[in-house]
Structure formats: C-alpha cells, structure tokens
Interface confidence: medium
C-alpha cells in the first residue's frame, strides 16, 4: 500500500480468482484513543472500533472511503484505491491503446519546436468518475524539472456506436536549451482514477523525435506572366524555433486535383517558395518537417489554384 | 530523407555542403544498421545514449547560435561565448569564437574517425561478417575534416590483441552511430548558420 | 441512517415544467464522492436514468432528453432538484431519486413519487 | 450509450431451483456493472455492485459474475420472497442504462 495524495492509498493486488489479498492497517488521524468506530462509504455499518482498523483487501468491494467517527462526529477519511495486476502485468481499462505508432500506445506526444514545450494527450470512452494526474520529468535516477498543468478534456468524438473522449496536458522543461543535444528522455507519467481502480501510463522519448512543426504561415499564389505556372511563396510558422537558419525546415509542395483519384505533383524544397503548374479546380499544399532530423511533417496549409 | 530535395549553392561556404552529405551518409548507415541488426538492442529506445565527445569538445555550447545566448539554460556549461576558421570562411568573416566552435567540430570527427576505424577492423573479423561500415560514411568524415582544414597530430588507430566481443561491438556500433547521427544534426545546423550570416 | 424521499406535483398537463425535489437524510453533498441521481419508471416498464449531480456540482443529463433536464441542489437543506420542462403524456412514470456513492451503484432509493400527465 | 440486453424476460421457477439472468453490454463496460432487485410496489433495491460484489446485508443465495460485455446474474436456491423483477445496470459511461428486466414469477 502506498500514499497517492493526502488521504488516498492505492492497494496493488494480484487479481486471480481467490487471490488471498493484502492486509492493510488503517490508523484514526485523530489524538483520540477510545470510542472511535469505522465505517466505509457512509454506509451507517459499524466495520469495527478501535483506533486502527484490520482489513483484508481482495476486491473492489473492500476499497472505498473508510471513515473513523467519535460520538456521532467524523474524525478522518481514508480513500482506498485497488491498482490490479493480471499475470504480472498492471491493468489498462482505463485508457484506449491508441496503436500507433506501435502496439500498447496509450499517450501520445508532440512538440511544435525545440523550447522544451510539448503537450500529450490520451483517449478513453468512460465519461464519469474520472480523475487524472501528470507529472513529468528529464531522465528517472537523477530527475530534472518538468512542469504539467492539469489534464483537461479536450475532444469527444463519436466512433460507431462509441463515444471517445480525448485529454491532453501541456508541459514544459523547467530549463531548455532549444540547441541542447538530448541524452536523457523526458518522462512523462500519468495517474489514472476511475472510481475505486488506479492505473498508471508512462511514456518516454526525447523531444526531437515528437517535434511537429505547426503547417506554414502566409501561403500566398502569385501567377507568372504568360504561363500557367504560378510561384508558392509561404513563411516559417511562428511557432517554430529560432533563429530559423539554425533551426530549417524543409518544404513538401503538392498540386492536386480536385478528385483524390487524380495524380499528384510534389516537390521537395529547403526555399520558402516554388514554381509549380497550377490545374484548374486543383490546389496547392506545402507542409513542413524539420531539415536535418526527420521527426513528422506537420500539416498541410493549403490555398485554392483559381 | 531519399526525396529529390533542392540545395543551396555549396560554393559560398563548402562546408556546408559537406555536412548535409555526413548527415545523409551517417543517416543511412544507421538504417543499415537497425535493419541488419534487427535482433540486437538497435533503436533510440533501446539503446543508451552515449557521447563520446562530453566533457572533451564542447561544440553545441561554442556553436552556440548568438540569438540563443541570451537563454539561460543555454549557458549553462559555456565558458566560451559564440561562434570561426579553417577554409570553409572567408578570411573576412574569421572570428575567434567562430574559429573555437569549428575547431570543436574538426575534434568531434577526429574522434569519431577513430573510434569508427576501430571498429571496423573488429567487424573485419567477424566470421559471420554481418554488417561493416559504410566507406562513403568514413570518406564523408574525412572531407569534411579536409574541408575544415584544422592542423592535428593524427591519433593512431586503437589496436587490440584480443578477441573481440562481436556481439558488444556491434551494440556499441549502434550506439556510436545514434549519437554521431545526433552530432551531425548539431554540425548541419550551425553550418547552415554560418552560411546565412 | 440514509433516507431519501420524492415529491412532486402529482399531476400536470402537457407542456407544463415537472419539478421534482429529493430530501434526504443520513449523508451530506458536501461530502467528496457522494452524488444524488434521478431515475423514471413508467408504468409496468423499465427504468430510465435522468440525470445524476456530484457534491462538486458536476453535472450530467442522459443526451436524450437533456435539453429539457435541469438538475440543482441546495446542499445546506440536503434537497436536490429535477425540472423537466414541456412534458407531455410519455412522461408520465414513477420518479426516484437515488443516493450514487463512491461504489458508484444506487445504493439508496426514495420510494418514489408518481407523476401523471394529462389533459 | 451502452445498451444493456437483459434475458431472460420472464422466468417462472420453483422454490429451491436455481436461475440465472445474463446481460449482455453493446460495448465493453470494464466491471460497472449493478444488479438491483425490485419487488411489486417497492423501489429497486441494491443487490451486487462492481458486477460481482454483494452489497450489505444481501443473502449469499445472490450472486454475479463477468466482464467487459457479459455478464451473470444467478439466485442459487430461489426462495419465495424472491419475488421480483431484477434488473442490470452499467454506470460505466453515462448515460447511466438499465437492462429491460427479468420478471421473476415463483410457481
């Protein structure tokens, strides 16, 4: 058993059919030491008396808010939270595998340039009786700061018959240099609570290879004379790093077609602007991916041919 | 990045020009080297991330771009200030700083070089002769050397009379090449800076 | 001991706003992890979950009827409300409310209030 | 919203028999999953919570079982007083369902 916060314990069981349990000792936070009776979840049943309370802890039934009472007056709580292991492995009901990029994803994480700032996020259909908490730090055995707000719900999407909700947190590095070469991972670890069940998530990785540029800015056509060529000019998003001839990017610029079926044109470019033939009903997207480290292309920022 | 990409005119500033190809060449030795080894610990998550360079060059604190100089955390370490010689400058645009932080880099290929030689000769002798160094990788290396034109005494190749432990060579080759790859990223940025002032 | 305990109009016509209130006795909305929820039952037929409301004043409403729920409470009376506005004959049912603890089942029921609707 | 489908509709028993009602979660509902008890003229009474566990004060004859989308509700030896119509719910998402109910009639 282990503290989660101020009077909230998590109990880590074996979960297997007659699993024996865990013997958890809860003691009165109280300088009482006669008269004190326990009861769990407000229910009026006297569990026993005494200044500590003896419980066996086997299921979901035996966790929940213990609470000591003196003369009709409560003197402490004590929430009791079961985190379970199946076959040695930690339970994920909580949380959707998000599956990409591999198996057993379940947050997800990005970085719009090199300042030490990423958000995650992370998917689960249940709707109620949910709490998060993130804590974040560069590298385990000697931890360096990170800094994560809260975890707010930040989409619901309808999947078939499913509803999913998304979360994401923001986080930055207490001290980043955005030209640091990286050689300890940033960790991030989630606490999960649905109702009485406790699951943790972690996820590991360096900021370089979750970096996704914001699509670029300003992307404007200007036709050339007596051709049906047109120049793409676009600028470096503003939230990329700088100065930006240290931090590059490189450009993708596609032609396509109004039907999906049509061929596309793409050219790769390190300049910020283009030459391309513009079709008519076509359009012209330019997305951007950092020049020496290929982490994701970010988005496409598109602009009609007409 | 094997798109048809459009480069800058190397002819301003030839250094540049060789480190977009050490990036490149060191990118696809490390490809090669993930699919080749693909049951050894070969991944960035896998591996351990070590620079052999730490506390013996100090490139990304000399390299350091000016605009990031007023950044704190970016400070930490330096006891030197910005940014250069050798032949990629003009003699004009020469600074001390600059000279410090190309000297850093001519230091990180110089060792990398040898460590690389190194263990080429080992993975020579591995009977199932399973993965070896690119050449175009150690012939980059050595343009750009070439190209930075620093004079230093050649360091003599590490020889070891005993067996090697291929299986420990071949992690410790994943190893070199994911930092090295990480260096070459570092050395690629600070080239282009150098080539727009 | 907990108690909880409906009362309405008894009858209304259509279109008219149903409100409902729950008194109950034996735990307190000031508490963390107690909520209170209501709950319908036609007659002869199933239950329907309403809405339910967390001792933060978290709220949520089943979506099918949302735009015409509103639950409220007044922790200090330990009275909780239901309005359901432009009723018509299909809400006619046996209203509960029900105490929704930490084990997240009704663990407690009001006897329930009967509601009809006509005109 | 989850649809919990509750069978059987109907069960006629006698005393001593055993019975066992299922209700199957349109989609996985971990294991927040009630059973609850309603006699004639009487508010729904809680039985097991948590799929499996019994609430206080409930005869050890009730008892449930499963998992995600199935699950098993059995009164190993049917007493009269078991008169009711018993009813699954899942308060793992909201909207918070039932299923439609087990009448339960003793021969």
């Known amino acids: 058993i282990w503290e989660l916060k101020k009077d909230v314990y998590v109990v880590e069981l074996d979960w297997y059919p007659d699993a024996p349990g865990e013997m958890v000792v809860l003691t009165c936070d109280t300088p009482e030491e006669d008269g004190i009776t326990w009861t769990l979840d407000q229910s009026s049943e006297v569990l026993g008396s005494g200044k500590t309370l003896t419980i066996q802890v086997k299921e979901f039934g035996d966790a929940g808010q213990y609470t000591c009472h003196k003369g009709g007056e409560v003197l402490s709580h004590s929430l009791l939270l079961l985190h379970k292991k199946e076959d040695g492995i930690w339970s994920t009901d909580i949380l959707k595998d998000q599956k990409e990029p591999k198996n057993k994803t379940f947050l997800r994480c990005e970085a719009k340039n090199y300042s030490g700032r990423f958000t995650c996020w992370w998917l689960t259909t249940i709707s109620t009786d949910l709490t998060f908490s993130v804590k974040s730090s560069r590298g385990s055995s000697d931890p360096q700061g990170v800094t994560c707000g809260a975890a707010t719900l930040s989409a619901e999407r309808v999947r078939g018959d499913n509803k999913e909700y998304e979360y994401s947190v923001e986080c930055q590095e207490d001290s980043a240099c955005p030209a640091a070469e990286e050689s300890l991972p940033i960790e991030v670890m989630v606490d999960a609570v649905h109702k009485l069940k406790y699951e943790n998530y972690t996820s590991s990785f360096f900021i370089r290879d979750i970096i996704k540029p914001d699509p670029p800015k300003n992307l404007q056509l200007k036709p050339l004379k007596n051709s049906r060529q047109v120049e793409v000019s676009w600028e470096y998003p503003d939230t990329w790093s700088t100065p930006h001839s240290y931090f590059s990017l490189t450009f993708c610029v596609q032609v396509q077609g109004k039907s999906k079926r049509e061929k596309k044109d793409r050219v790769f470019t390190d300049k910020t602007s283009a030459t391309v033939i513009c079709r008519k009903n076509a359009s012209i997207s330019v997305r951007a991916q950092d020049r020496y480290y290929s982490s994701s292309w970010s988005e496409w920022a598109s602009v009609p041919c007409s | 990045r094997n798109l048809p990409v459009a480069t800058p005119d190397p002819g301003m500033f030839p250094c540049l020009h060789h480190s977009q190809n050490l990036l490149r060449a060191v990118s696809n030795m490390l490809q090669k080297a993930r699919q080749t080894l693909e049951f050894y610990p070969c991944t960035s998550e896998e591996i351990d991330h070590e620079d052999i360079t730490k506390d013996k060059t100090s490139t990304v604190e000399a390299c350091l771009p000016l605009e990031l100089t007023k950044n704190e955390s970016c400070l930490n370490s330096r006891e030197t200030s910005f940014i250069t010689n050798g032949s990629c400058l003009a003699s004009r645009k020469t600074s001390f700083m600059m000279a410090l932080c190309l000297s850093s880099i001519y230091e990180d290929l110089k060792m990398y070089q040898v460590e690389f030689k190194t263990m080429n000769a080992k993975l020579l002798m591995d009977p199932k002769r399973q993965i070896f160094l690119d050449q175009n990788m150690l012939a980059v290396i050595d343009e750009l050397m070439q190209a930075l034109n620093f004079n230093s005494e050649t360091v003599p190749q590490k020889s070891s009379l005993e067996e090697p432990d291929f299986y420990k060579t071949k992690i410790k080759l994943c190893i070199l090449l994911h930092a090295f790859r990480i260096r070459a990223v570092t050395i690629d940025r600070v080239m282009s800076y150098l080539n727009a002032s | 001991q907990v108690t909880l305990k409906e009362s309405g109009p008894g009858i209304l016509q259509p279109s008219q706003t149903l409100s409902l209130t729950c008194s109950f006795s034996?735990?307190?909305?000031?508490?963390?992890?107690?909520?209170v929820s209501w709950i319908r039952q036609p007659s002869g037929k199933g239950l329907e979950w309403l809405a339910h409301?967390?001792?933060?004043?978290?709220?949520y409403y089943n979506p099918s009827l949302k735009s015409r729920l509103t639950i409220s409470k007044d922790p200090s009376r330990n009275q909780v409300f239901l309005k359901i506005t432009s009723v018509d004959t299909a809400d006619a049912a046996t209203y509960y409310c029900?105490?929704?603890?930490?084990?997240?089942?009704?663990?407690?029921w009001g006897q329930g209030t009967s509601v009809t609707v006509s005109s | 919203s989850v649809v919990m489908t509750q069978t059987p509709k109907f069960l006629l028993v006698s005393a001593g028999d055993r019975v066992t009602i299922t209700c199957k979660a349109s989609?996985?509902?971990?294991?927040?999953v009630a059973w609850y008890q309603q006699k004639p003229g009487q508010s729904p009474k809680l039985l097991i919570y948590?799929?499996?566990n019994r609430y206080t004060g409930v005869p050890d004859r009730f008892t449930g079982s499963g998992y995600g989308t199935d699950f098993t509700f059995i009164i190993s030896t049917v007493r009269a007083e078991d008169l009711a119509v018993y009813f699954c719910?899942?308060?793992?998402?909201?909207?918070?369902?039932f299923g439609g109910g087990t009448k339960l009639e003793i021969k």
């Open positions: 409301i967390y001792w933060d004043d978290d709220k």
């Open positions: 034996g735990f307190s909305l000031r508490k963390s992890v107690m909520g």
């Open positions: 989609q996985s509902v971990s294991n927040d």
């Open positions: 719910q899942q308060d793992y998402n909201s909207p918070w369902t």
């Open positions: 029900t105490r929704r603890g930490i084990r997240s089942a009704m663990d407690y």
């Open positions: 948590y799929a499996s």
